[in-house]
């Protein structure tokens, strides 16, 4: 088919982050076309010569795909007709970070949008009471982080208190030699209080809460990706 009018179509992307070793999504939507065969999706990455992915005439066209993405990409083929050009990226690598372009051609015209994709490792922390310790102690553990995060403790009762003097944080390199296990211990814990262990790097922020009373222990965890425009 040919592009016969001088029109540009709206393409929208969302900055996102990928968790090393897991699958990620690079989000892209566009003004849909009525015929799937008239839609071409091209994903490009700055600095890469070949294509990240190409979808045209209703199927993947991977003859020009760059070696670094071979066998790791897919679009949601059944959703292309409704304007979803998002890319699924399998087994996210640290080197997948960078600027991507979602480039769309339809019978209505062309359009493109860039997105920043960050890569790293982030995981939910779990806070437990350390019964083996000599004093009341909390232990906050998160299995996979990269780059190295900061760990800050907070308490509901002692709001604004600095716990750096009564806590100890260590980072242990995992077997794949990239991500690290985060372990932080908080000493001199008082009963009837809620403590928060906050782990943060430039990709994600995670919080593990623990409420300790004489009768029960309640836990809650939360993870939030940073710099993702929702």
């Amino acid at each position: 088919f040919g592009i016969s009018g001088r029109h540009s179509i709206t393409v929208t992307t969302v900055a996102s982050a990928g968790n090393i070793g897991e699958d990620g999504i690079l989000s892209c939507t566009f003004e849909p076309d009525i015929k799937l065969s008239d839609i071409v999706i091209q994903w490009l990455k700055e600095g890469v010569l070949g294509l990240v992915h190409e979808f045209k005439e209703g199927k993947d066209e991977l003859s020009e795909q760059d070696e670094m993405f071979r066998g790791r990409t897919a679009v949601f083929a059944d959703q292309v007709i409704v304007g979803n050009a998002s890319l699924r990226l399998k087994n996210v690598q640290l080197t997948d970070a960078g600027t991507y372009k979602c480039y769309i051609i339809t019978s209505k015209g062309k359009g493109n949008a860039n997105l920043e994709y960050k890569t790293g490792a982030f995981s939910m922390p779990e806070v437990n009471v350390d019964y083996n310790a000599s004093s009341e102690t909390l232990r906050c553990e998160a299995p996979r982080w990269f780059p190295q995060p900061t760990v800050v403790w907070a308490s509901q009762v002692d709001q604004g208190a600095n716990f750096s003097e009564v806590s100890n944080t260590s980072f242990e390199l995992n077997s794949e030699n990239v991500t690290m296990k985060v372990v932080s211990v908080l000493y001199n814990v008082t009963i009837n209080n809620t403590y928060s262990c906050m782990i943060e790097n430039d990709i994600a922020k995670a919080t593990g809460d623990i409420k300790v009373t004489e009768s029960e222990i309640k836990r809650r965890s939360h993870l939030q990706l940073l710099n993702s425009k929702a």
Partner: antibody
């Protein structure tokens, strides 16, 4: 200021070799793909070769395939073009240019290569 | 391989509009870039992605692309616009047009 500065040009006999260099500054060189483009005297622009940011992928024009090798040293912010088995038709001004998606957004001032006996 | 055809020359009076065409099979489905090259100087990108302008390039430079023809339009032409102009697309390598010499009368 973003800058590309080519060097290494000169007069060389047919069949001999020459290595061009391009020093990059003012941007994160290691994240950008790069190109060599040439222009014979009085002629138009001809793309020669491209290299990915990591240096793992390279493309060549048919006219230089098997004779020219593009490479880069990201620690030195430098792009290279090794030219072997030079021919008279390789005589040109050689430009290095930064790749931007499907085009080139920054060019060097060029270095002249003359292949003559 | 993919070919791009440009007129060898275009002449225009100062203050008028110059249009330089670039022909290629279904070029409308490709992203077209335009470069200006003055004698003894390196090329300069004046339009990218069919119609976008890099910072520092006057608004007088614009581009369009549809069907089998891409066009670089220079409005209110000045003497300093006299140069060679090249269109370019990517097709497993950079493909340049044959070049057009713009003469300001």
């Amino acid at each position: 200021e973003v800058q590309l500065v080519e060097s290494g040009g000169g007069v060389v006999q047919p069949g001999r070799s020459l290595r061009l260099s391009c020093a990059a500054s003012g941007f994160t060189y290691s994240s950008r793909a790069m190109n060599w483009v040439r222009q014979a005297p009085g002629k138009g622009l001809e793309w020669v070769s491209a290299i990915s940011s990591s240096g793992t992928t390279t493309y060549y024009a048919d006219s230089v395939k098997g004779r020219f090798t593009i490479s880069r040293d990201n620690s030195k912010n430098t792009l290279y073009l090794q030219m072997n088995s030079l021919r008279a038709e390789d005589t040109a001004v050689y430009y290095c240019a930064r790749k931007r998606w499907y085009g080139m957004d920054v060019w060097g001032q060029g270095t002249t290569v003359t292949v003559s006996s | 391989s993919y070919e791009l055809t440009q007129p060898p020359s275009v002449s225009v009076a100062p203050g008028k509009t110059a249009r330089i065409t670039c022909g290629g099979n279904n070029i409308g489905s490709k992203s077209v870039h335009w470069y200006q090259q003055k004698p003894g100087q390196a090329p300069v990108l004046v339009v990218y992605d069919d119609s976008d302008r890099p910072s520092g390039i006057p608004e007088r430079f614009s581009g369009s692309n549809s069907g089998n023809t891409a066009t670089l339009t220079i409005s209110r032409v000045e003497a300093g616009d006299e140069a060679d102009y090249y269109c370019q697309v990517w097709d497993r390598g950079m493909i340049f047009g044959t070049g057009t010499k713009l003469t300001v009368l």
